[in-house]
Interface confidence: low
């Protein structure tokens, strides 16, 4: 990789080791300016593996509210609108970074935390185990 | 909700306003200890809306590597293994938080940033616009 020279205008830091405590500006910069806000808001209903969105709230976490997807069916919706159990609705999961207040209840001190969230569901062919 | 008293052991903060700069410990705590790491590793191939994973790397971002899903087909895979263009493969997108070095190239100063990533694909019924 390229070695990027350190910016001389950086704030001072007493601890240069990793893991380390860093300063983070919580004024979120949004890079998604060109996206359509309604981009995927109805996929949860139109999908052959539809899902519901459940609210997950934790005041000790930043962001405090996250929406979790739960697949509606074990099977997938076929062309007739019925559930086909020869296929499986499965959650697509992703690990995301959140900030956890540490020590607890502190407004200005956090620890980076990795959590697993279900973002939506997809329809997959099941793995069939044949008995010999 | 319960009003949680402020922990007396919290670090001092000169700026109690929001948006604000906070201290963040980058030693990541992983809450996903009980999950199977192979949980959805093959869904991208078994899905009726399969996808490829592309590596997105940015040394000024934390985490520096993010994997992006790209749907393989416009349509979805039917029971015969062919692409059915009466259905659509669409990306499931999620907004995630990352840390952006600010000022650039600083090892210990970041700004919270929100980026949109495609996590996987799902098969949806298309919206058909009927011409009057």
């Amino acid at each position: 990789g390229i070695t990027i020279p350190r910016n001389p205008g950086c704030p001072n830091s007493e601890d240069k080791n990793f893991p380390r405590t860093v300063m983070v500006n919580l004024n979120i910069h949004n890079r998604n300016t060109n996206t359509n806000p309604k981009r995927s808001s109805d996929y949860y209903n139109r999908s052959t593996s539809p899902w519901n969105l459940h609210r997950n709230e934790d005041p000790e976490r930043y962001p405090s509210v996250i929406w979790e997807a739960k697949c509606r069916h074990l099977g997938c919706i076929n062309a007739d609108g019925n559930v086909d159990y020869h296929m499986n609705s499965v959650p697509i999961q992703q690990e995301i970074l959140v900030l956890r207040r540490e020590p607890p209840h502190c407004p200005n001190s956090f620890r980076l935390e990795k959590i697993l969230v279900s973002v939506g569901c997809t329809c997959v062919t099941p793995i069939v185990h044949h008995v010999a | 909700g319960i009003t949680i008293p402020r922990n007396p052991g919290c670090p001092n903060s000169e700026d109690k306003n929001f948006p604000r700069t906070v201290m963040v410990n980058l030693n990541i705590h992983n809450r996903n200890t009980n999950t199977n790491p192979k949980r959805s590793s093959d869904y991208y191939n078994r899905s009726t809306s399969p996808w490829n994973l592309h590596r997105n790397e940015d040394p000024e971002r934390y985490p520096s590597v993010i994997w992006e899903a790209k749907c393989r087909h416009l349509g979805c895979i039917n029971a015969d293994g062919n692409v059915d263009y009466h259905m659509n493969s669409v990306p499931i997108q999620q907004e995630i938080l990352v840390l952006r070095r600010e000022p650039p190239h600083c090892p210990n100063s970041f700004r919270l940033e929100k980026i949109l990533v495609s996590v996987g694909c799902t098969c949806v019924t298309p919206i058909v616009h009927h011409v009057a």
Epitope: I28, N30, P37, K38, S40, S41, L53, N56, P63, V65, I66, W67, E68, A69, I96, V117, V119, G120 | I92, Q93, Q94, E95, L97, K114
Partner: nanobody, 119 residues
């Protein structure tokens, strides 16, 4: 440029009422869920209430259920919070915020309006 401007805060006695307003501009208001969030003195942020794009669904934190009502007027690009039966513990700076789904993060905030409940 996205702007959210809160108003309607002030000093009120316990049991009293206030109506907060949030005037917005710079984005398609009717396409977004909107939120009220508050920060009490020396405390962290607390989500208070949210309303979906068309106003069909509303959520409240337990401590304000039955006392606060969130509403919106998409024609006026405005968000409101009717606060009744106010308590001392409702004292905080109230922010309106614009958000997204999957998952939900607040991306824009107003400057806040201070609500003080005291006798």
């Amino acid at each position: 440029e996205v702007q959210l401007v809160e108003s309607g805060g002030g000093l009120v006695q316990p049991g009293g009422s206030l109506r907060l307003s949030c005037a917005t501009s710079g984005f398609t208001f009717s396409s977004y869920g909107m939120y009220w969030v508050r920060q009490a003195p020396g405390k962290g942020l607390e989500w208070v209430a949210e309303i979906k794009q068309d106003g069909s669904e509303k959520y409240y934190v337990d401590s304000v259920k039955g006392r606060f009502t969130i509403s919106r007027d998409n024609a006026k690009n405005s968000l409101y919070l009717q606060m009744n039966s106010l308590r001392a513990e409702d004292t905080a700076v109230y922010y309106c915020a614009k958000g997204e789904i999957l998952p939900l993060y607040f991306d824009y905030w107003g400057q806040g309006t201070l609500v003080t409940v005291s006798s």
